[in-house]
């Protein structure tokens, strides 16, 4: 069956954890991608802004989880949730705005 | 104030088992990420392991000398670590530390912060 | 398994400049940390990230990376600074720390 969105919620903050401990290194060589409004549609919109990422093994898990809680198909070049693209920040950036907001979301118990 | 205090150290024969415990107080345990090292005598620091924090999936890693003999522990409510150690060994005799773990000091929840206990001291001999 | 390597000891006389390297393959990509620890008593945290420096700790140390080498350079090294220290770092998962084999540094009183 589908799995529930705690369960997904925290592997998805594990997997941003995997990605970022004690790295100094650019991710996925300093790549820069859309910054994105962390409210409603954020699981969308971080898919949408990752995915035109290629080529970067160390992200693919993370997005194959925000696959999983998008609820629509989400392919590269689409932007329908990413409502303002005026800034674009590293991954490594991204991925720790991402988590901060992730954990958040979590000890407020708000799953979805 | 900022403190871990270890205790359940003590002498034991080879093959026995002891169990320590660092108990923490001054920050918010629950975020923070959790690391055993250890010092035999005259010699320098090995780390022995670490736990997450629960929210970041509580992982817990060893090192490959310890690695099916101990196990890391956390109780968040009663802010405690713990170091099972059983199987020992002469070589496991050492001042173990337990520590707030650097690696894991990110995000806003206790970001830079170092804290170490003062250490108790297992023996293992005959 | 993934090793640090530093200079069993360093002397200095008081006032120079003392530099305790640490070297590892992982190093260009995850960060190092330097820990203090005098006779009998805790380590304490000197310098994290390569570079950062905690608070409470003298702005004579410093700390710096390039390629596979981690450096913490004493700038006018003091009697009290006497002590062993070590670096640390992780392997390249992040996930199984390592410290180097310390480095005893002697400051000629």
């Known amino acids: 069956g589908p799995v529930p969105p705690s369960t997904a919620l925290r592997e998805l903050i594990e997997e941003l954890v995997n990605i970022t401990q004690n790295q100094k290194a650019p991710l996925c060589n300093g790549s820069m991608v859309w910054s994105i409004n962390l409210t409603a549609g954020m699981y969308c919109a971080a898919l949408e802004s990752l995915i035109n990422v290629s080529g970067c093994s160390a992200i693919y898990r993370t997005q194959r989880i925000l696959h999983g809680l998008c609820p629509h198909k989400v392919s590269a070049g689409q932007f329908s949730s990413l409502h303002v693209r005026d800034t674009k920040i590293e991954v490594a950036q991204f991925v720790k705005d991402l988590l901060l907001h992730l954990k958040k979301l979590f000890r407020e118990g708000q799953f979805n | 104030e900022v403190q871990l205090v270890e205790s359940g150290g003590g002498l034991v024969k080879p093959g026995g088992s002891l169990r320590l415990s660092c108990a923490a107080s001054?920050?918010?345990?629950?975020?923070?990420?959790m690391s055993w090292v250890r010092q035999a005598p005259g010699k320098g620091l090995e780390w022995v392991g670490r736990?997450?924090?629960?929210?970041?999936?509580?992982?817990?890693n060893y090192a490959a000398p310890v690695k099916g003999r101990f196990t890391i522990s956390r109780d968040d409510s009663k802010n405690t670590l713990y170091l099972q150690m059983n199987s020992l060994k002469t070589e496991d005799t050492a001042v173990y530390y337990c520590a707030t773990d650097q690696v894991g000091a990110y995000y806003g929840d206790y970001y830079g912060m170092d804290v170490w206990g003062q250490g108790t001291t297992v023996t293992v001999s005959s | 398994s993934y090793e640090l390597t530093q200079p069993p000891s360093v002397s200095v006389s008081p006032g120079q400049t003392a530099r305790i390297t640490c070297s590892g393959d992982a190093l260009p990509e995850k960060y190092a940390y330097w820990y203090q620890q005098k006779s009998g008593q805790a380590p304490v945290l000197v310098i994290y990230e390569d570079t950062k420096r905690p608070s409470g700790i003298p702005e004579r140390f410093s700390g710096s990376s390039s390629g596979t080498m981690a450096t913490l350079t004493i700038s006018g090294a003091q009697v009290e600074d006497e002590a062993d220290y070590y670096c640390y770092s992780t392997d390249s998962s992040g996930n199984h720390g390592v410290f180097g084999g310390g480095t005893k540094l002697t400051v000629l009183g």
């Open positions: 736990i997450r924090s629960k929210i970041d999936g509580g992982t817990i």
């Open positions: 001054g920050f918010t345990f629950s975020n923070a990420w």
